[in-house]
């Protein structure tokens, strides 16, 4: 009785989820009498996987035929593998006992590991925009992968980041893992067609990384430039006003025009031109009736951008002075808007 | 009908040692990890460890390594725990209780002893 | 270790009264949680085993749930001997351990 061994050839496999596991055991004879069971992990919390006298184990089948009077092949298959089968696998003899058969004798044990691939990286950024110059974070998450080890990079562009913090967890044994990481992003008036890419590695993907984007024009905003100029126009009583609102992202503006600190006309960007870096143009004109006019009239550019505090520029028009002497002829970047007379 | 007879209170001076039992009938004794839980006077439970009377095969919760060591008598169906070098600390009740010989829901810490009262005392 | 933190630790309720005492475990162990009552004399007693199932020969006043890792022990309709200590044992993994009780006090 002594005599018997029970092996389990295999210190370890490992399987991808999704595929079957086959785990090895065989008896080196066939004495004493009495069935053979699988349990995953040891101690008092080890779980039965297979019972050959009795109960009902749907994902696994022996590999041979037990019922055949010789055999000495106690492998099985267990189907449909997922992470969470992950563990350390005991093929053990009993012996025929009355009434219980007693655990007689176990195999050294396989370790079963799973590869599961990572979950296709989710990109976050802030909740609210932020200008040029400041420091964004960005997170990148991932889950569900097996074994730990893993490799995140960021790029911006394509150019690498280094600014950047991972953590995989749980710490300890699991499962499956998942991974976070948070980096940090300086943002340029340039990066309204920047991309954040975060590219993750892993023993499954066979070198094809998978990759999780964030678009920085969901992130920024480019406040304006105002300048506001005159020019004339045919008719010697009348000047022309215009207000160009340069460099600006994203497109959601409105511009007040303000007499002398008075609301003269309230409009909403429409009909805009894109630059090569992805921030707008926009322009407003104002045609003012000088005539109508005793004193010299302060107007004011008034641009609420983005939801921000409002930003203006003001130009002082001397009505005592020739029109034609005024200002300069900057009509080349007029992309239109309303006119409008002061009477 | 399943049952767990516990030793009798104990009275120990500091330094010593006590070992109690736990003797089992009503069911097979080998199926079974029998295990030792704690509970100091006024506090909760603690678990000390479990030994499984096939193969003496024990498990032990770290706070309780080298302070009690889990043995068996097959034969008579009888666990036993050591305590030793006793303190204040050890003074508690002991109770023993079961579970299946794999982890089968329904057979975890149903059966307990009575419990047995060790007093450290100089 | 997985912690099991219970509350409350001690409740004062009317017979008749519904009451709920709670474990919340610090990690994942599934449905494997026991509770345990233990009587002024040390007699301890498993009430509900994996999570909800009713031990035989328990009063069906008493009913186990989970809610993520919260983990609840009802009674519904206190009698007089229920005005006992409750405990937790989680059982997924070792070492094995216990919430810290409930004593339940009659009003």
């Known amino acids: 009785e002594e005599g018997l061994q029970v092996i389990q050839p295999d210190k370890s496999v490992s399987v991808a989820a999704g595929e079957s596991a086959i785990l090895h055991c065989t008896a080196t004879s066939l004495i004493p009498v009495g069935p053979i069971q699988w349990f995953r992990g040891a101690g008092p919390g080890r779980e039965l996987i297979y019972n050959q006298k009795e109960g009902h184990f749907p994902r696994v089948t022996t590999v041979s035929d037990l019922t055949k009077r010789n055999n000495m092949d106690f492998s099985i298959r267990i189907g449909n593998i997922t992470p969470a089968d992950a563990g350390t696998y005991y093929c053990v003899k009993f012996r025929k006992g009355s009434p219980d058969d007693v655990e007689f004798k176990s195999g050294a044990g396989t370790e079963l590991s799973v590869r599961a691939k990572p979950s296709a990286p989710v990109v976050s950024g802030p909740a609210a925009r932020a200008t040029p110059q400041h420091t964004v974070s960005f997170t990148c998450e991932s889950h569900g992968f097996s074994p730990r080890d893993i490799t995140l990079k960021w790029f911006k562009n394509g150019n690498e980041l280094s600014d950047f913090q991972t953590n995989v967890d749980p710490v300890g044994e699991s499962v499956s893992y998942s991974i976070h990481s948070t980096a940090k992003v300086v943002l340029t008036r340039e990066d309204v067609h920047s991309q954040v890419i975060c590219e993750v590695a892993h023993v499954t993907l066979q070198g094809d990384p998978l990759r999780g984007t964030a678009n920085l024009s969901e992130t920024i905003r480019v406040p304006p430039t105002l300048e506001v100029t005159q020019q004339p126009v045919r008719a010697e009583n009348q000047v022309n006003v215009t207000c160009q609102v340069r460099k600006f992202y994203p497109q959601r503006l409105q511009l007040t025009w303000l007499e002398n600190g008075n609301v003269s006309r309230t409009e909403t960007a429409s009909t805009v031109t894109e630059n090569k870096d992805g921030t707008y143009n926009w322009m407003s004109w104002l045609l003012v009736n000088v005539s109508a006019h005793r004193d010299d009239v302060k107007l004011t550019c008034q641009v609420e951008h983005d939801g921000q505090p409002a930003v203006s520029k003001s130009h002082d028009l001397k009505v005592s002075a020739h029109p034609k002497e005024q200002g300069s002829n900057t009509a080349a970047e007029n992309t239109g808007s309303n006119e409008r007379n002061i009477y | 009908e399943v049952q767990f007879q516990q030793s009798g209170t104990v009275l120990a001076r500091p330094g010593t040692s006590v070992k109690m039992s736990c003797k089992a009938s009503g069911s097979t004794f080998t199926s079974y990890w029998m295990h030792w839980v704690k509970q100091g006077p006024g506090q909760g439970l603690q678990w000390i460890g479990a030994i499984y009377p096939v193969n003496n095969d024990t498990t032990y919760n770290q706070k309780f390594k080298g302070k009690a060591e889990l043995t068996v008598v097959t034969s008579t169906s009888t666990a036993y725990m050591e305590v030793s070098s006793l303190t204040n600390e050890d003074s508690a009740v002991y109770y023993c209780t079961r579970s299946f010989y794999y982890s089968l829901d329904a057979a975890w810490f149903v059966y307990w002893g009575q419990g047995t009262l060790v007093t450290v005392s100089a | 270790d997985i912690q099991m933190t219970q509350s409350p630790s001690s409740l004062s309720a009317s017979l008749g009264e519904r009451v709920s005492l709670t474990c919340r475990a610090s990690q994942d162990i599934g449905s494997r949680l026991n509770w345990l009552q233990q009587e002024p004399d040390g007699t301890i007693k498993r009430l509900i085993y994996a999570t909800s199932s009713l031990d035989s020969g328990v009063p069906k006043r008493f009913s186990g749930s989970r809610s993520g890792s919260d983990y609840s022990l009802t009674i519904s309709g206190l009698e007089s001997e229920d005005f006992v200590d409750y405990y937790c044992?989680?059982?997924?993994?070792?070492?094995?351990?216990f919430g810290g009780g409930t004593k339940l006090e009659i009003n």
């Open positions: 044992l989680q059982y997924a993994s070792s070492p094995f351990t």
